[in-house]
């Protein structure tokens, strides 16, 4: 299963994607600035096999697609980007999905890490937070589209890691 | 291992126009800002303004508002000060620093080594 | 724009003290300062991010405390490479501003 290197492309474009759906300057955000935690930690470990790499990342994918599948986010972001960015995340995560069961028979390590899928859970809990708490402001996306772009740009250096254990 | 390489000494006069550099290397040029910082001989830090070298968006200090000029090609990984009319009190040392944008990440992590211009007729 | 004054604007201390140095905002700015360190003829030095945060690679001597509109660098014990020019600098908003400078110097 040549995932890592189908994957990213796909995050590539998504990252493209997610740079282009800016509606206001980031300059007049500043101070909205906030610390999301992300895991870092779930990314660096070299411990995963690769079923249980693959289902981390799958989780982040997928909590980011809930999170621009919501109708704050469609109020907020030009549609036919979002949309655009949307399937990019969907078809990443049907990628995903056909590796793991490919994978299984190769592993005899459990599927999935659930500490690490529940610190990726835990990570999209505060960003959710801190949107309801600023009461979805334009700002508030702003501040979060860079830290998806962030998190994104992080698991792709996870990724190339992961091509390069193969 | 990250690196802003600025370009060197300038030395002109007054009424000419200049244009200085920093070069990104070893990170995502358009994953931060880039800023100038001026300092004048002696003196202290004054923050002229801001790159989003994604998309060439700027902000200035209304002090240096209209004085000078902030652009990017991300192409080249490089930032851009310029001046169209230098006066004898641009006279000073010039530095880029990049910053995270609206990540929770330190600012001004990394500094070019800096541009000393002097304006002198 | 926030003002960022800080005090002293110069100091005198001995190799092994414990030296303060405070900046005050001109309004509420958070958590959002930064500490800087520089030595003739260099480039600024990052030392504390976000008021208390220290840098990679930076001494543990120095530490950063405050929230609002005053802050602290402190040095715990002051090292012969430490006698250097120090700035705070606000990144709430913009304009960014800095402090006008401490220069912490040889007793």
């Known amino acids: 299963c040549d995932l890592p290197q189908t994957h990213s492309l796909g995050n590539r474009r998504a990252l493209i994607l997610l740079a282009q759906m800016g509606r206001i300057s980031p300059f007049s955000c500043l101070k909205d600035r906030h610390d999301f935690g992300f895991p870092q930690e779930e990314f660096d470990g070299n411990q995963f096999q690769k079923a249980q790499a693959i289902s981390v990342l799958h989780e982040m994918i997928q909590q980011t697609f809930n999170l621009f599948s919501t109708k704050d986010s469609s109020a907020t972001w030009e549609q036919s980007l979002l949309e655009k960015f949307s399937t990019e995340l969907n078809q990443q995560l049907n990628d995903m999905e056909a590796c793991v069961i490919q994978e299984v028979g190769v592993e005899e390590t459990p599927l999935m890490n659930v500490d690490s899928i529940l610190a990726v859970k835990k990570y999209f809990q505060r960003i959710t937070l801190y949107l309801t708490e600023k009461k979805y402001s334009p700002c508030a996306w702003e501040v979060v589209r860079a830290e998806i772009m962030r998190s994104f740009s992080l698991s792709k250096i996870f990724q190339e890691r992961l091509r390069r254990k193969e | 291992e990250v690196q802003l390489v600025q370009s060197g000494a300038e030395v002109k006069k007054p009424g000419e126009s200049l244009k200085i550099s920093c070069k990104g290397s070893?990170?995502?040029?358009?994953?931060?800002?880039i800023g100038w910082v001026r300092q004048m001989p002696g003196k202290g830090l004054e923050w002229m303004g801001i790159?989003?070298?994604?998309?060439?968006?700027?902000a200035y200090s209304p002090s240096f508002q209209g004085q000078v000029t902030i652009s990017a090609d991300k192409s080249i990984s490089t930032a851009y000060l310029q001046w169209s009319s230098l006066k004898a009190s641009d006279t000073a040392m010039y530095y880029c620093?990049?910053?995270?944008?609206?990540?929770?990440?330190?600012?001004?992590?990394?500094w070019g080594q800096g541009t000393l211009v002097t304006v002198s007729s | 724009d926030i003002q960022m004054t800080q005090s002293p604007s110069s100091l005198s201390a001995s190799v092994g003290d414990r030296v303060t140095i405070t900046c005050r905002a001109s309004?509420?700015?958070?958590?959002?300062l930064n500490w800087y360190q520089q030595k003739p003829g260099k480039a600024p030095k990052l030392l504390i991010y976000?008021?208390?945060s220290l840098q990679s690679g930076v001494p543990s001597r120095f530490s950063g405390s405050g929230s609002g509109t005053d802050f602290t660098l402190t040095i715990s014990s002051l090292q012969p490479e430490d006698f250097a020019t120090y700035y705070c600098?606000?990144?709430?908003?913009?304009?960014?501003?800095f402090g006008q400078g401490t220069k912490v110097e040889i007793k």
């Open positions: 620093a990049r910053h995270p944008g609206l990540n929770w990440a330190p600012d001004f992590d990394y």
């Open positions: 070893g990170y995502s040029f358009t994953s931060y800002w």
């Open positions: 790159i989003d070298p994604s998309d060439s968006d700027t």
């Open positions: 309004q509420s700015i958070d958590g959002s």
């Open positions: 976000f008021a208390s």
């Open positions: 600098q606000q990144s709430y908003d913009f304009p960014l501003t």
